[in-house]
């Protein structure tokens, strides 16, 4: 899987989407995960809702809010008031049980506001 | 109508290939997964593994890697299981399954039987 | 990989009466977080393919009669089969799919006394 790398400017709103076939993960949930290390457990930061058919619905964990649309097959994660300690790299997962399936590998990137001090 | 219908019996040789087949009709296919399940004489089932034909996505019993493969062509709405190099203990009657993204199976074919005898 | 143990291995019921199968298994299949048990009943009938009759614990299968019923939590399941006919008999099967490799009990086979 290619990784893709999205940026975002420190303080602000980072939306990151990722796309699936929604026929191949029907009844499936979602998860929002940060890759500990190269090689380490992707550690859960939130997941959609326990019934998949309120996925729709905004789930929140922190600043982090996850929301997954199963007609088009897009879940769609919002990392608010973006923090340098939010930079790394994370994974949209399809979850069946206990088994995740990776849907893509995003790299997250926070750029300080030149304007600050 | 949905239909699985699988290749007939073989009789083979140790050491011989084999690719037996399922064809699904009557629903999407590739938008489906598909199981193989094996049923050795007498005894229980095993899944084997499962494919979905959309874009041949695979995965396998660690018990099954490496000894069969799992394919699939969407053009002809068919999905296969084969084996390089037969042994006797691949003797069994093979099932084709019709699997939800959350793995369980709802359509099952009528059963391939495969004996392996020199 | 987590091991189905069903029980009995057989089954001899009279028609009419209540028929219970047992499926134990070595992990919990209760998800935590979605609150699903994911755990699915098969019947095989003599000389057939099998046919799902419940999943996800205790969901009927399309055209399944209601005199099936699953039951159970976390490591321990019940299959049971109410007023049962002569069409009922065949091997029954639990199977695990919370995660691979799916794995299923060795089968509980029921037959007419």
């Known amino acids: 899987l290619n990784t893709t790398v999205l940026q975002g400017m420190a303080g602000q709103s980072l939306r990151v989407s990722c796309t699936y076939d929604a026929l191949k993960h029907w009844g499936r949930r979602k998860a929002w995960c940060r890759q500990l290390g190269e090689e380490g457990p992707c550690q859960r930061v939130v997941s959609t809702h326990g019934v998949w058919l309120l996925a729709f619905l905004k789930k929140r964990n922190g600043s982090t809010v996850i929301a997954d649309d199963t007609l088009a097959g897009t879940v769609t994660i919002t990392l608010k008031n973006l923090q340098a300690g939010d930079a790394g790299l994370y994974q949209c997962q399809s979850l069946r049980g206990r088994e995740a399936e990776v849907l893509q590998k995003v790299l997250v990137e926070v750029l300080e506001d030149p304007l600050d001090d | 109508e949905v239909q699985l219908v699988q290749s007939g019996s073989e009789v083979k040789k140790p050491g011989e290939s084999l690719r037996i087949s399922c064809k699904g009709s009557g629903y999407s296919f590739s938008s489906y997964w598909l199981a193989w399940v094996r049923q050795m004489p007498g005894k229980g089932l095993e899944w084997m593994g499962i494919i979905y034909p959309g874009d041949s996505d695979t995965r396998y019993s660690p018990s099954f890697q490496g000894q069969v493969t799992i394919s699939a062509d969407k053009s002809i709405s068919t999905a296969y299981l084969q084996w390089s190099s037969l042994k006797a203990s691949d003797t069994a009657m093979y099932y084709c399954?019709?699997?939800?993204?959350?793995?369980?199976?709802?359509?099952w074919g009528q059963g391939t039987l495969v004996t392996v005898s020199s | 990989d987590i091991v189905m143990t069903q029980t009995p291995l057989s089954l001899p019921v009279t028609p009419g009466e209540t028929a219970s199968i047992s499926c134990r298994s070595s992990q919990s299949l209760l998800d935590s977080e979605d609150g699903n048990t994911y755990l699915d009943w098969y019947l095989q009938k003599p000389g057939q393919s099998p046919q799902l009759l419940i999943y996800?614990?205790?969901y009927r299968a399309s055209g399944v009669p209601d005199r099936f019923s699953g039951s159970g939590s976390g490591t321990d399941f019940t299959l049971k089969i109410s007023r049962v006919e002569a069409e009922d008999v065949g091997v029954y099967y639990c199977?695990?799919?919370?995660?691979?490799?799916?794995?299923f009990g060795g089968g509980t086979k029921v037959e007419i006394k």
């Open positions: 199977m695990q799919r919370i995660e691979s490799p799916l794995t």
């Open positions: 399954a019709r699997g939800t993204p959350l793995f369980y199976f709802t359509y």
């Open positions: 996800t614990l205790s």
